[in-house]
Interface confidence: low
């Protein structure tokens, strides 16, 4: 049966979803276990011109071999205002000084990056040492690069489309995810549904997605259900500021009782099917419906509070 609920974009003041993911448009992770220099390459695209970027490098001490030296090659297409955090890491940074401005002096060794196309930049980097990771990111707001983490099966890093960087790289896009909402026809009451659909990633290892839900309503004003649907290898850690009904695939737990896993359900994996699920749970409003790439952290902020959906 078709569910009549015309999903329309919701204004950011009614609902906003941000997320952190390891999925990249192009990337690779390789192992270079005996290399003296760990080389990472980031190609960053900023479609709207000058941007601010928070870039954090984290070192993992493996077998007491850290620190080895790190070369980070930063290729950007427009002006970037960079906050770099790389405490205690023997970092060499190669970048275009006319495009990258540091919010404070970086305190690391720097090299001017030649104005080469991507393939030549990779070759230039590879001449300095085996490339551990390379990624192409579109409009990042923050990036976390974990050093000494490379779990790749490759011995040579070659950019490939639609890659999962695993623990090596996590990033947060600047643009929040598209949030849509609708009224479920023929359902009375003020119960609202928040539906989050996480799409399958490019590697199928077990994943926990942390879902932070912040609804700006007085607790008594709210009758809500949170529907979380994802691939079978995804479990959920829920951090919510309201009590609400939970309906998920896989297993879920709450941040306040992380050790207590609760079994979820088999849920439909289509938007129509999930809208049907919301209707079956007596929701009259889908306050937010979001589809995301496989993420590690998702934050939902909404201020619908039942019965007052506004689309943009």
């Amino acid at each position: 049966e078709t569910v009549h609920c015309d999903l329309q974009p919701v204004g950011p003041e009614r609902g906003e979803v941000t997320y952190t993911t390891s999925q990249v448009s192009k990337g690779c992770v390789a192992q270079a276990p005996n290399a003296i220099l760990e080389v990472h390459v980031l190609f960053l695209e900023f479609p709207t011109g000058p941007s601010q970027l928070e870039l954090t490098l984290q070192a993992s001490k493996q077998n007491g071999t850290w620190p080895r030296e790190v070369l980070l090659v930063l290729s950007v297409n427009s002006s970037v205002f960079l906050h770099l955090q790389a405490l205690g890491i023997p970092l060499h940074l190669a970048y275009n000084s006319s495009l990258v401005t540091f919010q404070e002096p970086p305190g690391v060794n720097t090299t001017e990056l030649p104005s080469f196309p991507k393939t030549q930049i990779l070759e230039w980097a590879a001449e300095r040492g085996p490339i551990t990771s390379a990624a192409e990111l579109n409009d990042p707001q923050s990036i976390l690069l974990r050093l000494g983490q490379a779990q790749g099966s490759l011995s040579f890093c070659m950019l490939e489309a639609s890659q999962d960087m695993g623990r090596t790289l996590e990033w947060r896009p600047r643009t929040p995810a598209l949030v849509r909402g609708c009224h479920l026809e023929g359902v009375a009451g003020h119960k609202e549904a928040h539906i989050l659909r996480v799409l399958p990633g490019h590697s199928a290892g077990p994943r926990t997605v942390t879902v932070k839900v912040e609804l700006s309503c007085a607790p008594g004003d709210l009758d809500a259900v949170l529907i979380l649907q994802g691939p079978p290898y995804v479990s959920w850690l829920i951090d919510a500021n309201h009590n609400m009904q939970i309906w998920t695939t896989g297993e879920y737990s709450f941040k306040i009782f992380p050790e207590k896993n609760i079994r979820g359900f088999k849920l439909p994996d289509t938007p129509q099917g999930l809208l049907g699920e919301a209707r079956m749970l007596n929701a009259s409003i889908v306050a937010s419906f979001v589809e995301l790439p496989l993420a590690s952290i998702v934050s939902l902020h909404a201020s619908s509070c039942g019965g007052r959906l506004q689309t943009s």
Epitope: E13, G49, S51, T56, S79, F81, H83, H301
Partner: antibody, heavy 118, light 106 residues
């Protein structure tokens, strides 16, 4: 809607202390870089200092004029920013604004007046 | 520290006039941000990264410049535009503001 509401201003004697608060709502406070900017009566804007986000280990930065006397802190669980002002001088008299930095100062509070006078 | 010098410090003009506010940095900066302030009110974000208007700012405003010289231009002054405008840089620590330009009705 982003809202920043300052409080805690008032009259204090030179050498005294005061703590300003800024209650934030309408955005993910823990992800935000938050600043204090002040404006002496009839004068221009002066940056006081900043505290970075959780991802940046809450790093703090200060203007030379307040370094060692002022401390910026935050409580992400309460969505609140603080400015602890010690050893106050008459030249610290100003309206203090709490602001959010996101590419630029995209949100400002209404300000709270601090008067340092004997 | 990078010093920011705004000129003129005050500007007297009529509704419909074109107004140009200049901000000169003591050394090169990556880009400039602008804020509008009316008496007794908090500053409002007005333009960022040199040429991008903040949300809700009318298109009669435009920003331009590079290096040390930046301008905020109002193509046709409207009554609500009479206010003080501040430029600001953060290409190098510490963050600094210009001294402000007061746009007054002639």
């Amino acid at each position: 809607e982003v809202q920043l509401v300052e409080s805690g201003g008032g009259l204090v004697k030179p050498g005294g202390s005061l703590r300003l608060s800024c209650a934030a709502s309408g955005f993910t406070f823990s992800d935000a870089w938050m600043d204090w900017v002040r404006q002496a009566p009839g004068k221009g804007l002066e940056w006081v200092g900043e505290i970075r986000s959780q991802a940046s280990n809450h790093a703090t930065y200060y203007a030379e004029s307040v370094k060692g006397r002022f401390t910026i802190s935050r409580d992400d669980s309460k969505n609140t920013l603080y400015l602890q002002m010690n050893s106050l001088k008459t030249e610290d008299t100003a309206v203090y604004y709490c602001t959010r930095w996101r590419r630029f100062f995209d949100s400002w509070g209404q300000g709270t007046l601090v008067t340092v006078s004997s | 520290d990078i010093q920011m010098t705004q000129s003129p410090s005050s500007l007297s003009a009529s509704v419909g006039d074109r107004a140009t506010i200049t901000c000169r940095a003591s050394s090169s900066v990556s880009y400039m941000h602008w804020y509008q302030q009316k008496p007794g009110k908090a500053p409002k974000p007005w333009a960022y990264a040199t040429s991008n208007l903040a949300s809700g700012v009318p298109s009669r405003f435009s920003g331009s410049g590079s290096g040390t010289d930046y301008t905020l231009t109002i193509s046709s002054l409207q009554p609500e535009d009479f206010a003080t405008y501040y430029c600001q840089q953060w290409s190098s620590n510490p963050l600094t503001f210009g001294g402000g330009t007061k746009v007054e009705i002639k």
